[in-house]
Each structure stands twice: as structure tokens, then as C-alpha cells.
Interface confidence: low
């Protein structure tokens, strides 16, 4: 089953209202509004590919960790061909850096770059030329990074530019989740992802209503992955006797019918001169006159 | 059509403070930087204070740093200049004039300072 | 003292062609920053006359161009006419100052 995406952070559904932080203060990152497709976007962006020695910092609001373990940080952001300036731009760049911080608190406006960690440098996959740009065809990148595992109650991201001329039009932050899932005739229940790719986290299944671990069978499990898959099913439930398997639920057997043991089988027609069973059966007694034997299975008709 | 009107200029005493603002109209202010240039009786002109369309970029020329404060409401298409410990050096015509600095769209700075207001003028006496 | 040099004055009969220089450094425009002209006449606001080095805004004569070399940039006027008497003042930026923006020190065309 897919993962499930519970999204922390959403600069580019937000409309331009997150109010992040530049460092310097008044140099670098700048919040600017385009119309495209007749809609305003909201994009960071920053291009002092002119003047060496850039360090221009934009720092998130805290976000609220909750129950993550691991983040997932989805970027789109676009970037212009350095060869699209003046003399080629001796500093230009055509890469920024993606950091990140835990804290327990917000700290405001109050920014130490010594707090963050850097996650990786982003590189564009494509950057935008000057002939695409004139015909304002600009070459968007999406770029994906994990972090985790993360333990204090909340978090900041980070973005460093030194030199490049970038615009950032989407930052998106989410944790995964395994969803709610029925599988073997278990219940399993929606589960956070664990944040380290070697570990699985293992997640008991309860057997579903009239459904049972048959004898010397193994209790259902999976394991709930990074990516916020189920893997890797460990033992399964069956239908009780007087009940099989619709679907994902176990149903009675219908009037008439039986089932004598939990088993992967369906409900079986009750056999010859036996009396019409009600519904779940688990066995169809005989008509008057009629009998087996005790080591007969309940399937065998009764005789005389 | 496309107007920039300033306001709010007279005499004061060094050390006095006044605002200066700039009220645009005819065009979409709130998509644009702005800036604040002036010229003292005289003499050339001198920039003095940039602030951008969302006004998360400031900047202010060494001569005023700490003294004028630069802001902006873009619902009522007003640019101020708040001007504080003024000295007679401050003594000048401010403009207000529509800009651009680099970004990703322009690249890097090549439209100009393309609309100007006429000036209010700042004298700074005892 | 300007960052960008621009002569205090030139002159020219109606009808001749004149030059105005602007000569900065390899902070400013030899870095590839652009230069923009204005043109200032007596008693009124500065208008923007070329920008971008070269290109001249809706409603500037074409009498009117600019060109930018290395760490130079000027503004030539062509068909000099009475109406063309004002100060004009080059306009870059300075990746080693504070806010980047400079102007240059003003030059007076009189049209004799």
C-alpha cells in the first residue's frame, strides 16, 4: 500500500504568508509575487551573482514536529545559467545549500547559523538559459531530501545561498505514515514511518471479527517502512468455524451451509439426509434415522 | 497614469525628525521596490534608502545608517522615510523613484529608476 | 567625491554631437553592472533617459544612445537641441558599497 504524506510545512500553499527569516537582515532572499497563469505565486529569490563571497541565509518558521521521525523535504525551485549574465559572472553559482535545526522552542527572529546542520548542497537537474528565459520558459527542478531521526519538538530549514541566481517557488515539508491497512483477514493499524532506512518498524495486525490465528500458526505482522510501505507480511488470520473469507471480513455461513474448522476454505453445502443447518453453522446434524460414524468428517452424508 | 507624489517636507532643527512619504498611483505598487534619492541644493543626486516590493530587503547609504528608517504599506500605496537626528548635511530635495534590484527575474539590475516624484524639500537649520 | 567620474560640463551648438563620460572601476561597472543615464532639466525631477547601457525608454528621441567599455560608460547626444540644456547623471551599481546603488557626480550640458 502507497504511503501516507501528512505535510508539516507548505510555503506555496500558504500565498505568500509564512513571513521567513533573511540573514543578513535586508540583503539576499527576497519575497517576490509573480502572476502566472493568471494566479499569483509566491516565490524566495535571490541572484547577487555580481558580488563574490556571498552568504545569505533564509530560515523557515519553527515547524512543529509532532510525531515525525523522519522529514521528507520536497523543493521546487528554478535556476539561471550563469553564462546568462555580464562577462559570465566570475562568483556566480549555480548550486544553494539546504540545512536544517532541532530546537525545543522557537527562537524568533534570534538566528545562529552555528545550529544548523547542513542536509546536502542542491544542484538543479536543468537551469534556465537565457534564450528559455526571454520566452519566460524556466526550467523547474524538484528535489527531494530526507532527515531524520529527529527528537526534539520542533525543527527550522535553512537555506544558503553563496552566489547563485535562484528562485524558490515550492518548499514542502511531510513525514509518512503506513495507512490503515487490511491485509490476511488482520487489522493493521496506521503507523508512523521509522526514521532509519535499515530498521523496520514491526506492527502486530489484530485477526478481523470471527477471524482467528489458527493453531501453531504465527500472529500477523508487517513491517512499516521508511517510505511509509507495509513489507514483508508475517503470519495471517483465518475464518472461525461457521464463517469464511468475502473480501477482507469473515461472513457466516448461509443457512444450509457449514464449515467445520478455521480454514482458508469456503462454507461447504451440507451434505446428504442432514437437516438444513441455520446460518454459521459449523456442522449439519443428521435427519432422523440417519447417522455417522464418529470418526466421519462432517462432510460425509449420514447413512442408515 | 503611473505618479509618484511625495510629502512631508519642511524646515527643522538638527537633531529634529520628520516623515517624509511617497504616494504612488497607476501602476500595481506592491509589485515594485522603491527608493528615496536626494539632492542637496546645488549639488548631485545621492542615493539614499532602497526597500523592496515585501520589504524583507532594506538597504541605506552609509551617510544615513541608523538614523532613517525606511518602510512601506503596500495596502495604501505609500512609501515612507522616517528621519531622525537630522543634521544640516541632511539639508536637500528627496525624491522617490520606482526600481528594481536583482532578482531572479530581472537577473540583475537593468531597468533603472523609471518613475520619479517632483521632490519634497527637507531644510535642516537652526 | 563620486564613485562613478563624470566630467562637471560640456558644451555643443544646436545641430552638433556631444559625449558624456562615466568611468568607474572593476567594482562597478567593469564588474558587468549596468549603467542607466538621467537627464535632469532645470527645476523639474530626474528622468529616466537610457537604461540597461543602451536602451532608451518609450517617448526618448533616438538623438539620444548609450554605450558601455570595460570600466567606461557614455551617453551621446546627436542634433544637439535648446531643450537638451540640463544635467545628466550616470547610474550603476557597487558591489562593494552598501545598497550597491551610485550615481555619478552630474555633468552640465549647455547647448551654446
Known amino acids: 500500500a502507497q504511503g501516507k504524506e501528512v505535510v508539516l510545512l507548505d510555503f506555496a500553499a500558504a500565498g505568500g504568508e509564512l513571513g521567513w527569516l533573511t540573514h543578513p537582515y535586508g540583503k539576499g532572499w527576497d519575497l517576490m509575487q509573480n502572476i502566472m497563469n493568471d494566479m499569483p505565486i509566491y516565490m524566495y529569490s535571490v541572484c547577487n551573482v555580481m558580488s563574490g563571497d556571498q552568504d545569505n541565509w533564509l530560515r523557515t518558521n519553527w515547524v512543529y514536529r509532532g510525531e515525525a521521525e523522519r522529514i521528507f523535504i520536497e523543493l521546487k525551485f528554478t535556476v539561471r545559467d550563469c553564462n546568462s549574465f555580464p562577462g559570465g559572472a566570475s562568483s556566480c553559482k549555480e548550486t544553494f545549500n539546504l540545512y536544517y535545526a532541532e530546537s525545543d522552542l522557537d527562537y524568533g527572529t534570534n538566528f545562529q547559523k552555528r545550529l544548523f546542520t547542513k542536509i546536502d548542497t542542491i544542484a538543479p537537474d536543468e537551469i534556465t538559459v537565457s534564450s528559455d528565459f526571454e520566452a519566460r520558459h524556466v526550467k523547474l527542478n524538484v528535489e527531494e531530501r530526507s532527515v531524520g531521526p529527529l527528537t526534539r519538538k520542533g525543527f527550522y530549514l535553512a537555506f544558503q545561498d553563496i552566489g547563485a541566481c535562484v528562485a524558490l517557488l515550492s518548499v514542502r515539508v511531510y513525514y509518512k505514515k503506513c495507512p490503515e491497512l487490511l491485509q490476511g483477514l488482520a487489522h493493521f493499524p496506521e503507523t508512523i514511518a521509522g526514521s532509519d532506512a535499515p530498521s523496520l518498524a514491526t506492527v502486530a495486525g489484530t485477526c478481523v471479527d470471527h477471524a482467528v490465528v489458527p493453531p501453531g500458526g504465527e500472529e500477523p505482522r508487517m513491517h512499516c517502512a521508511v517510505d511509509g510501505e507495509w513489507l514483508v507480511p508475517i503470519g495471517q488470520c483465518l475464518c472461525q468455524a461457521g464463517y469464511e473469507k468475502v473480501e477482507d471480513a469473515c461472513q457466516a455461513c448461509s443457512p444450509g451451509f457449514f464449515k467445520f474448522e478455521a480454514s482458508e476454505s469456503p462454507c461447504l453445502e451440507c451434505p446428504e439426509h442432514t437437516l438444513p443447518s441455520p446460518e454459521g453453522a459449523t456442522s449439519c446434524e443428521c435427519e432422523e434415522g440417519f447417522f455417522r460414524a464418529p470418526q466421519d468428517p462432517a462432510s460425509m452424508p449420514c447413512t442408515r | 497614469q503611473v505618479q509618484l507624489q511625495e510629502s512631508g517636507g519642511g524646515l527643522v532643527q538638527p537633531g529634529g525628525s520628520l516623515r517624509l512619504s511617497c504616494a504612488a498611483s497607476g501602476f500595481t505598487f506592491s509589485s515594485y521596490s522603491m527608493n528615496w534619492v536626494r539632492q542637496a541644493p546645488g549639488k548631485g543626486l545621492e542615493w539614499v534608502s532602497y526597500?523592496?516590493?515585501?520589504?524583507?530587503?532594506?538597504y541605506y547609504a552609509d551617510s544615513v545608517k541608523g538614523r532613517f528608517t525606511i518602510s512601506r504599506d503596500n495596502a495604501k500605496n505609500s512609501l515612507y522615510l522616517q528621519m531622525n537626528s537630522l543634521r544640516a548635511e541632511d539639508t536637500a530635495v528627496y525624491y522617490c523613484a520606482r526600481y528594481r534590484l536583482p532578482d531572479f527575474w530581472s537577473g540583475y539590475p537593468n531597468y533603472g529608476m523609471d518613475v520619479w516624484g517632483q521632490g519634497t524639500t527637507v531644510t535642516v537649520s537652526s | 567625491q563620486s564613485v562613478l567620474t563624470q566630467p562637471p560640463s560640456v558644451s555643443g551648438a544646436p545641430g552638433q554631437r556631444v559625449t558624456i563620460s562615466c568611468t568607474g572601476s572593476?567594482?562597478?561597472?567593469?564588474?558587468?553592472?549596468?549603467v542607466h543615464w538621467y537627464q535632469q532639466l532645470p527645476g523639474t525631477a530626474p528622468k529616466l533617459l537610457i537604461y540597461?547601457?543602451?536602451n532608451r525608454p518609450s517617448g526618448v528621441p533616438d538623438r539620444f544612445s548609450g554605450s558601455k567599455s570595460g570600466t567606461s560608460a557614455s551617453l551621446a547626444i546627436t542634433g544637439l537641441q535648446a531643450e537638451d540644456e540640463a544635467d545628466y547623471y550616470c547610474q550603476s551599481y557597487d558591489s562593494s558599497l552598501s545598497g550597491h546603488v551610485v550615481f555619478g557626480g552630474g555633468t552640465k550640458l549647455t547647448v551654446l
Open positions: 526597500i523592496s516590493s515585501s520589504s524583507s530587503t532594506i
Open positions: 540597461g547601457n543602451s
Open positions: 572593476s567594482s562597478n561597472i567593469g564588474a558587468g553592472y549596468d
